[in-house]
Interface confidence: low
């Protein structure tokens, strides 16, 4: 007669354990178009053997109250519902379930649950995904203004994810060694949404330059929870007319990590 | 879990150099920025400086400056934090610190680092 | 720099007390403020961020107030661990500062 041979089992089931580790404090922070890996760490009691296991990435979106499938991996078998979402299966076997998400889009913010199946065990985790996209600054003179004496500065940020961002002007002297902010003057246009979802704004401010002291340093500072701290754009009033011919641009360095990145 | 493990003391004489590490675990290395923060005995908290874990960018207080170099070491996740020309008053435990998504979440347990003749 | 003073400098309170310990900008920091705890020969604990979220495994008696440039700690029914040293900071702009510290001891 046949011998059937199976694995040998060290403990019983009652003695087994499944559990599931996501990111620290339930949040992950991207930044749009970067790819992201979400993290999720399978802990088990046995080693484990990922021909019978599954993976099921899920997500649930921030408008809609609905879970779609992003991922799943049975034994045999994956697929990905959303194109280039991959689990490695290499790093699967040593425990890792983590979900790569490439090119990352502002409505793929939400709740992701990673649910891990070794039969007859299931455990799950969810994490939020939080989508950022830091502004791009310049700072430039609306030239339409021809008042003489008068000059209207405008400092845009374009292209930020969320909407809440905070644009101050700043002024130093040559008198005064600290910066002083600036009130008066000042107009701060609405957010405008781009087809994309992100964000611009505009902030301008009236300048009399035969009232200020050339070689007055201006700044227009700008603050988002992606940045990872304040950025500003400077300007100097040379003489009066001063006029800014070329707009400056300023390449932004921000954090990662997202979030109030103050 | 998150984990941030600093070198051990150090006792050094006025004018070394001394290099303390962070060694971090638990989480994606170079997603964050690392903060080094300085207490000198019985004081309060100095902020020095913070590199970006993918090494491309280093923050440093302009107090520090000539006297910090922050280096990363993205193979082993682990950061470095260089003091030059040591006097009696850099005498201190010195903390690495992960920048999470709102400022210091996690701290390494310190490094004391003493300065003496 | 923004300074960020604190007070009291030190304050003694008996288990269940209610305790509040102040922050005030030397500017407008928005909410950008953080609390710390520190016990002795310990490295600082994140309690607060944002000026009123707690960090998550934070108890709920810790609780944090306040915007613009005036910010409170407040400990709502002291326990006996959480006699300690705690520090505001601001991390709207650099260089980061914090307070001094107040330093809660038993009474």
């Known amino acids: 007669h046949h011998h059937h041979h199976h694995e040998q089992k060290l403990i019983s089931e009652e003695d087994l354990d499944l559990k599931v580790e996501m990111m620290a404090r339930g949040i992950q922070a991207t930044r749009l178009n970067d790819s992201v890996t979400i993290s999720c760490k399978v802990i088990y009691s046995q080693p484990l053997n990922i021909t019978s296991m599954g993976i099921t990435w899920f997500r649930k979106s921030l408008t809609l109250d609905k879970e779609v499938k992003v991922f799943e991996f049975f034994g045999d078998h994956q697929k990905a519902f959303r194109p280039g979402a991959n689990v490695s299966l290499w790093r699967l076997k040593s425990g890792d379930a983590s979900l790569k998400l490439p090119g990352v889009q502002l409505e793929e913010a939400g709740e992701y649950r990673c649910e891990v199946v070794v039969t007859p065990l299931k455990a799950q985790g969810t994490v939020q995904l939080k989508v950022v996209a830091s502004p791009t600054s310049r700072l430039f003179q609306d030239q339409a203004v021809v008042k003489e004496n008068e000059g209207k500065y405008m400092c845009e940020s374009s292209r930020f994810y969320p909407k809440d961002i905070n644009i101050t002007w700043e002024k130093w002297t040559q008198k005064s060694p600290h910066h002083v902010v600036i009130s008066e003057n000042v107009i701060t246009g609405p957010t405008i949404k781009n087809m994309d979802g992100t964000f611009n704004i505009t902030s301008y401010l009236k300048l009399n330059s035969s009232q200020e002291d050339p070689g007055t340093v201006y700044r227009c500072v700008i603050r988002h929870e992606s940045l990872h701290t304040p950025v500003s754009i400077d300007f100097i009033l040379t003489a009066p007319q001063q006029s800014l011919s070329e707009p400056e641009k300023t390449d932004i360095f921000s954090s990662g990590g997202g979030g109030s990145a103050g | 879990q998150v984990q941030l493990v600093q070198s051990g003391a150090e006792v050094k004489k006025p004018g070394a150099s001394v290099k303390v590490s962070c060694k971090a675990s638990g989480y994606t290395f170079t997603s964050y920025w690392m903060n080094w923060m300085k207490q000198a005995p019985g004081q309060g908290l100095e902020w020095i400086g913070g590199i970006y874990l993918s090494g491309e960018s280093t923050d440093y207080n302009e107090k520090f400056k000539g006297k910090v170099t922050m280096t990363v070491d993205t193979s082993t996740s682990t950061v470095y934090m260089e003091l030059s020309s040591l006097r009696s008053e850099d005498t201190a435990v010195y903390y690495c610190?992960?920048?999470?998504?709102?400022?210091?979440?996690?701290w390494g347990q310190g490094t004391l680092v003493t300065v003496s003749s | 720099d923004i300074q960020m003073t604190q007070s009291p400098s030190s304050l003694s309170a008996s288990v269940g007390d209610r305790v509040t310990i102040t922050c005030k900008a030397s500017q407008n920091v928005g909410k950008y403020v953080a609390w710390y705890q520190q016990k002795p020969g310990k490295a600082p604990k994140s309690l607060i961020y944002?000026?009123?979220n707690r960090y998550d495994g934070v108890p709920s008696r810790f609780s944090g107030s306040g915007s613009g440039t005036d910010f409170t700690l407040t400990i709502s029914s002291l326990q006996p661990e959480d006699f300690a040293t705690y520090f505001c900071?601001?991390?709207?702009?650099?260089?980061?500062?914090f307070g001094a510290g107040t330093k809660l001891e038993i009474k």
């Open positions: 944002s000026a009123s």
């Open positions: 900071q601001q991390y709207i702009s650099y260089p980061l500062t």
């Open positions: 610190t992960r920048r999470g998504d709102y400022f210091g979440d996690f």
